[in-house]
């Protein structure tokens, strides 16, 4: 009998609000025995796979996806899914990446530390759609983000 796979979690280092040109790393976590982690973007057709999976703890594995120089186009919701033979997990919750202009003054928001989206809830009715649509991006003052329908 196939085991029930736990939903993955996703987090961002150093946080989810990143200055233009700075780096960000998405961290996807799942159980041990994961073969492939996939990082997907809501409303975008692109994705990234890695089989470079490390053991984060005795019961957890993880993979890291790094963006060296964040641009406006990187803003938006991201989520993880993993493959543990013989099947794929459900998707994680979405984690929204916000990109801020570096020209902001001292009142600019600091980078949010260690934001994450974990398996804290069962999937919504739409979660079985692995490519759920979102509206096109909105640009706030000094901040790039994509509006996400919950």
């Amino acid at each position: 009998q196939e085991e029930d796979l736990p939903r993955p979690s996703i987090s961002a280092e150093p946080g989810t609000v990143i200055p233009l040109g700075s780096h960000v790393t998405f961290v996807c976590r799942g159980p041990v025995g994961v073969q492939t982690f996939r990082l997907e973007r809501e409303s975008r057709s692109t994705y990234n796979d890695t089989e470079d999976v490390s053991q984060a703890s005795p019961s957890e594995s993880e993979a890291r996806f790094r963006i060296d120089s964040v641009s406006e186009g990187n803003a938006g919701p991201y989520r993880c899914i993993y493959y543990k033979p013989p099947k794929w997990s459900e998707q994680s919750d979405y984690l929204e990446l916000l990109v801020k202009e570096t020209s902001g003054g001292p009142d600019s928001p600091d980078t949010e530390p260690g934001s994450s989206a974990g398996p804290t809830q069962r999937p919504s009715d739409n979660s079985h759609n692995e490519h759920a649509p979102a509206s096109q991006g909105l640009k706030a003052e000094h901040l790039y983000h994509h509006h996400h329908h919950h």
Epitope: S45, T46, Y47, Y83, K87, W88, N129, H131, P133, Q136
Partner: antibody, heavy 116, light 111 residues
């Protein structure tokens, strides 16, 4: 890497038929596979898809008429009760690495003829 | 259900010329879009996806643009080998399933 369709043949109307898309040279579990058909002298017509995560999608016209299923190396298209309008070349295709929007790998197609 | 309206149905152009093919979606599909070339007796060949990325081995004479509901394929410096039928496709899977629809095709003749 390649995909190849098989199972096409001459059948009489109402005779169930299963077409198979066989993957070689790549790990099928990572990819979406779509089925597309083309009637003689006509355009491309989408039938449905089996996604990497195991979900299936169908064109509205195909719901109830076909069933798509997958194993670790194949994706099958079962035609439950073919009619003469289902005479066509059937293609399967795999999406491109890193982007779900384009299907770069296509099989040569398999011909299905439905005739009494 | 999503409808892709492709225009024109056919077009004729001279060697060295330019052809523009348009595809309009009845709903927004973001960047979930591709263009294919098909010659008689052959399988379709991916030209453009995403919807402006050039597929491997495709010359830069082929250019895709657009997003949302309006998409364009431009073929410049036309060659005899470009004579074919061109199709647009949406591959969008979403909350309201929209994926997999093809446009009606555009037959390109080279004079």
């Amino acid at each position: 890497a390649a995909v190849k369709e098989s199972g096409g043949r001459l059948v009489t109307p109402g005779t169930p038929l299963t077409l198979t898309c066989t993957a070689s040279g790549f790990s099928l579990y990572k990819y979406n596979i779509q089925w597309v058909r083309q009637a003689p002298g006509k355009g491309l017509e989408y039938i449905g898809a089996s996604t990497y995560a195991g979900y299936t999608y169908y064109a509205s016209w195909a719901k109830g008429r076909v069933t798509i299923s997958r194993t670790s190396t194949t994706v099958d298209l079962k035609m439950t009760s073919p009619t003469t309008e289902d005479t066509a070349t059937y293609f399967c295709a795999r999406h491109i690495d890193g982007d779900y929007s384009g299907y770069a790998l296509w099989g040569p197609g398999t011909l299905v003829t439905v005739s009494s | 259900e999503l409808v892709l309206t492709q225009t024109p149905a056919s077009v004729s152009a001279a060697v060295g010329g330019t052809v523009t093919i348009k595809c309009q979606a009845s709903q927004s599909i973001g960047t979930w879009f591709a263009w294919y070339q098909q010659k008689p007796g052959q399988s379709p060949k991916l030209l453009i996806y995403g919807p402006s990325k050039l597929a491997s081995g495709v010359p830069p004479r082929f250019k895709g643009s657009g997003s949302g509901t309006e998409f364009t394929l431009t073929i410049s410096d036309l060659e005899c080998a470009d004579a074919a039928t061109y199709y647009c496709q949406s591959t969008y899977f979403g909350v309201d399933y929209l994926g997999g629809t093809f446009g009606g095709g555009t037959e390109v003749e080279i004079k």
